[in-house]
Interface confidence: low
């Protein structure tokens, strides 16, 4: 799977969209999970309504919401009041039985609030231990990675 970068400003909301084939994933609940390390598990953050027909209803877990347009084939995740610790690699998943298919890998980057007194150029990245190779990225706001570029800069 390619990785898509979504950039948001600290303190604001970030919307992540995950398109999918609505016919292929018909009847399946969806989930948003956070990748724990390069080879680690993907820890569930929030999932759509238990009744698939009600997937359009927004469900919250803390500051993260999920809603699913099952006809149009778009899963939308909202991260409210974005914080530096929200930066990292996530997955949109389609659930079937005890298994999960990855719909999209998402790299969330948190930009400093330009109205804040800190350097407006600040950008938080996941730690170096979470490096993922060869991310082909569709830019979502202002920046896209070059093919083959590692999404996390080396830290000194």
């Amino acid at each position: 799977h390619n990785t898509t970068v979504f950039q948001g400003v600290a303190g604001q909301s970030l919307q992540v969209s995950c398109p999918y084939d609505s016919m292929k994933h018909w009847g399946r609940r969806k989930a948003w999970c956070r990748q724990l390390g390069e080879k680690g598990p993907c820890q569930r953050v929030v999932s759509t309504h238990n009744l698939w027909l009600l997937s359009f209803l927004r469900r919250w877990n803390g500051s993260t919401a999920i809603t699913d347009d099952t006809l149009g084939g778009t899963l939308t995740i909202t991260l409210r009041n974005l914080q530096p610790h929200d930066a990292g690699l996530y997955q949109c998943q389609s659930l079937h039985g005890s298994e999960a298919d990855t719909l999209r890998k998402v790299l969330v980057e948190v930009l400093a609030d330009p109205l804040d007194h800190r350097d407006a150029g600040d950008l938080w990245f996941p730690g170096e231990s979470e490096s993922f190779e060869d991310a082909h990225v569709e830019h979502s706001i202002s920046r896209s990675l070059l093919e083959g570029e590692i999404p996390f800069p080396p830290t000194s």
């Epitope: 016919m23 018909w26 009847g27 009744l51 698939w52 027909l53």
Partner: antibody, heavy 123, light 112 residues
Framework: QVQLVQSGAEVKKPGASVKVSCKAS????????MNWVRQAPGQGLEWIGR????????NYAQKFQGRVTMTADTSTSTVYMELSSLRSEDTAVYYC????????????????WGQGTLVTVSS | DVVMTQTPLSLSVTPGQPASISCRSS???????????LHWYLQKPGQSPQLLIY???NRFSGVPDRFSGSGSGTDFTLKISRVEAEDVGVYYC?????????FGQGTKLEIK
Amino acid sequence: QVQLVQSGAEVKKPGASVKVSCKASGYAFSSSWMNWVRQAPGQGLEWIGRIYPGDGDTNYAQKFQGRVTMTADTSTSTVYMELSSLRSEDTAVYYCARLLRNQPGESYAMDYWGQGTLVTVSS
Amino acid sequence: DVVMTQTPLSLSVTPGQPASISCRSSQSLVHSNGYTYLHWYLQKPGQSPQLLIYKVSNRFSGVPDRFSGSGSGTDFTLKISRVEAEDVGVYYCSQSTRVPYTFGQGTKLEIK
């Protein structure tokens, strides 16, 4: 109307491979999962795996992992199931079967089946 | 894998009489979306299997209303209210809640 037409019977030697085809018509081929199920002589039904022709996504039963390959050609609405390293226990009738989709929710039942392809593995 | 167990394995019924086949799964067949993917198939002699009942109790198109399905969780039943000569064959229950999909061993229905 929906039709699934499979290729003819095959006789293979142990260790060889076989590739069975299933040509679909009468429905939106790309957006329905296709299954492969087999039935050994006088035995019950055994699920081998499935393929989604729209993007080639596959799921295989653990038992066949590494020996089975399913592919789809959307230009001809045909799915293929190749089984390698054949042994005598693989002698069976192989069926392709479409997954029914209904609202609300997908039923994940196999509503249309091919006529079956007998594969005989014998030295 | 989910193990499907059918009882009885064979059944001999007089035309016009009812018949019942039981199917038990080794784990719950309720999918994460709330639906239960338990289906019944009939394989008539020399033919490919055909779908009778899907999602526990829904008759597939063209299936006579003498066939009915019921159950929940791990216990399911297929009933034929009045058996006819054309109903002979092997009946299979099957689950598609979890991959790999699995089938019961089959129940052979004969006419007395």
